[in-house]
Amino acid sequence: ASTQSPSVFPLTRCCKNIPSNATSVTLGCLATGYFPEPVMVTWDTGSLNGTTMTLPATTLTLSGHYATISLLTVSGAWAKQMFTCRVAHTPSSTDWVDNKTFSVCSRDFTPPTVKILQSSCDGGGHFPPTIQLLCLVSGYTPGTINITWLEDGQVMDVDLSTASTTQEGELASTQSELTLSQKHWLSDRTYTCQVTYQGHTFEDSTKKCADSNPRGVSAYLSRPSPFDLFIRKSPTITCLVVDLAPSKGTVNLTWSRASGKPVNHSTRKEEKQRNGTLTVTSTLPVGTRDWIEGETYQCRVTHPHLPRALMRSTTKTSGPRAAPEVYAFATPEWPGSRDKRTLACLIQNFMPEDISVQWLHNEVQLPDARHSTTQPRKTKGSGFFVFSRLEVTRAEWEQKDEFICRAVHEAASPSQTVQRAVSVNPGLAGGSAQSQRAPDRVLCHSGQQQGLPRAAGGSVPHPRCHCGAGRADWPGPPELDVCVEEAEGEAPWTWTGLC
């Protein structure tokens, strides 16, 4: 067996079992679980005389380790005296010593409850610069207690003079506060409040909680996009399972149809997320006619960690239909960005909310990554609206200054599409009737000022431009207008855009 240091326990009688007139009393110290022999036990009896006797070591049968007991008999004024049993085990190390200090007898006592509370996060859910830990030691029979704070098991140098004790009836409570810097708290260390009372140790520990508390697994089932349904004519639906914890269990996604007819072969993809979760998607091709005729599709998700299967179903949206209105705009040139322009497309008052937005240039559809389109939002009425934004380059508009914003929606006729063309420089592209109208003059400034119209997307014309006020009931819907630079001595230039 390898070297093992002893565990040391005080041996005392219950105070109520010692006669009040007893002139001498015996207490003991048990050293157990050590190897090899020997241990040396000495006693500190203070001012009292005492006789000691150390019993021969016995072997613990299971482990082969040793145990021994040392007894101390004292006489005189022992009731108020504390005694220290000192156990040394030189085989463990030359300076290995364990001290136990205790009184002759143990009283019946109610042990304390130890609980650490921590200060709250700020309103935004972030940790403040300092974190307070409060150790509540409550409900114990009044007596001496020692509080020690540990950081990852190491004793901390803490001012304990702030600890306060109160008595409630026959029981007492004490509290001690520890203030930590945010850096220490976020370092993932464990903080322990250790309480020593009547020769016993009680403790509670805490640490910063994991960044992402485990959430329940969620499943979502999407409808086919109108573009896939009406233009590509190869619609798919996707079952998405999120917030799966890392596990050895397999996620099964099973497809079915309410009609009981067979489903096509699905494709599956698994992706790891930086927040430590797994996302699983299964994409199922569906028949265009089946979907339009109202077939319902179901996705069933099973996983060993789920208490029961998750079921999700999808079908064509019911309710009233309304075709989208499409409006396309070009923002003006912005100082420092002469070779780039932003085009905006407002699509509104459509029902249901399923819509696909595309941009085309030179009769070619631009990749989806080129534009950014909002999720459908409800209008004040019963329909929905979206905005789509496309950045174009000078090379593109000089090649052909016409860009098309196209909405694909089931209520649009005749071919489920509505589109609008927009030019970066409509005034230079043949001069529309709009650009010939003499506008009402209102000065536009580069900063937004009260009472002045503001260009869509937060941009405004050149600071030295006059702008048409648009409609008299401004701010009404934005309108296209002409701006003429008023700088004298320079060739005037026109700008057509939004004010």
Epitope: A245, P246, S247, K272, R274
Partner: antibody
């Protein structure tokens, strides 16, 4: 279980193919990794082939090592071998949903020496 | 690149003691971290996956913790059988990496 084979003593520049034979599970359901360990050194990830047959390699292994598979075996092709490639080569089953390797073969030793 | 740095390279611990091994990722890997134990002449054995989930049959004295870029393996109540080399491995990305494994920590039990 997994068992590697094909390890032997070769001279620098000699190409070599190591084979990992799987039993008890289907390679079509799991990713498979190759990992090597030079004598007295740590584990070095070479590459992985996923259930669909797509491959990913450590940046240092691209171009010199190729992973491929059949229904029951996974191969590691080693080209332009140098003495630095002397190592025990392990194949391991990679569970994508846990991000870990749960079954390992005993390894096969490749010694490159002139 | 997702590179793993493991410390210390070697540690000595007494039977019954506690040993702590740290693993640092060069960028966040969430909780996609596994720990392995390898004894001489044997292949590695999986201990922990998902930062803290014990593989079946692994004693509860092995504890994994951490998230993001900082991870820890703690072995408490060390036994002679725990003498081995321990490796961490990131399981977040299979792409753009030099080595999925940390350099290893040799645990010597006295």
């Amino acid at each position: 279980s997994l068992e590697e084979s094909g390890g032997r003593l070769v001279t620098p520049g000699t190409p070599l193919t190591l084979t990992c034979t799987a039993s008890g599970f289907s390679l079509s359901s799991y990713h498979m990794s190759w990992v090597r360990q030079a004598p007295g050194k740590g584990l070095e990830w070479i590459g992985v082939i996923n259930s669909a047959g797509n491959t990913y390699y450590a940046s240092w292994a691209k171009g010199r090592f190729t992973v491929s598979k059949t229904s029951t075996t996974v191969d590691l092709n080693l080209t332009s071998l140098t003495t630095e490639d002397t190592a025990t080569y392990f194949c391991a089953r990679y569970v994508f949903s846990s991000g870990s390797h749960d079954i390992w073969g005993p390894g096969t030793l490749v010694t490159v020496s002139s | 690149a997702y590179d793993m740095t493991q410390t210390p390279a070697s540690v000595e611990v007494a039977v019954g003691g506690t040993v702590t091994i740290k693993c640092q990722a060069s960028q966040s890997i969430g909780s996609w971290l596994a720990w392995y134990q390898q004894k001489p002449g044997q292949p590695p054995k999986e201990l922990i996956y998902g930062t803290s989930t014990l593989e079946s049959g692994v004693p509860s004295r092995f504890i994994g913790s951490g998230s993001g870029t900082e991870f820890t393996l703690t072995i408490s109540g060390v036994e002679c059988a725990d003498a081995a080399t321990y490796y961490c491995q990131q399981g977040y990305s299979e792409d753009n990496i030099d080595n999925a494994f940390g350099g290893g920590t040799e645990v010597v039990v006295k």
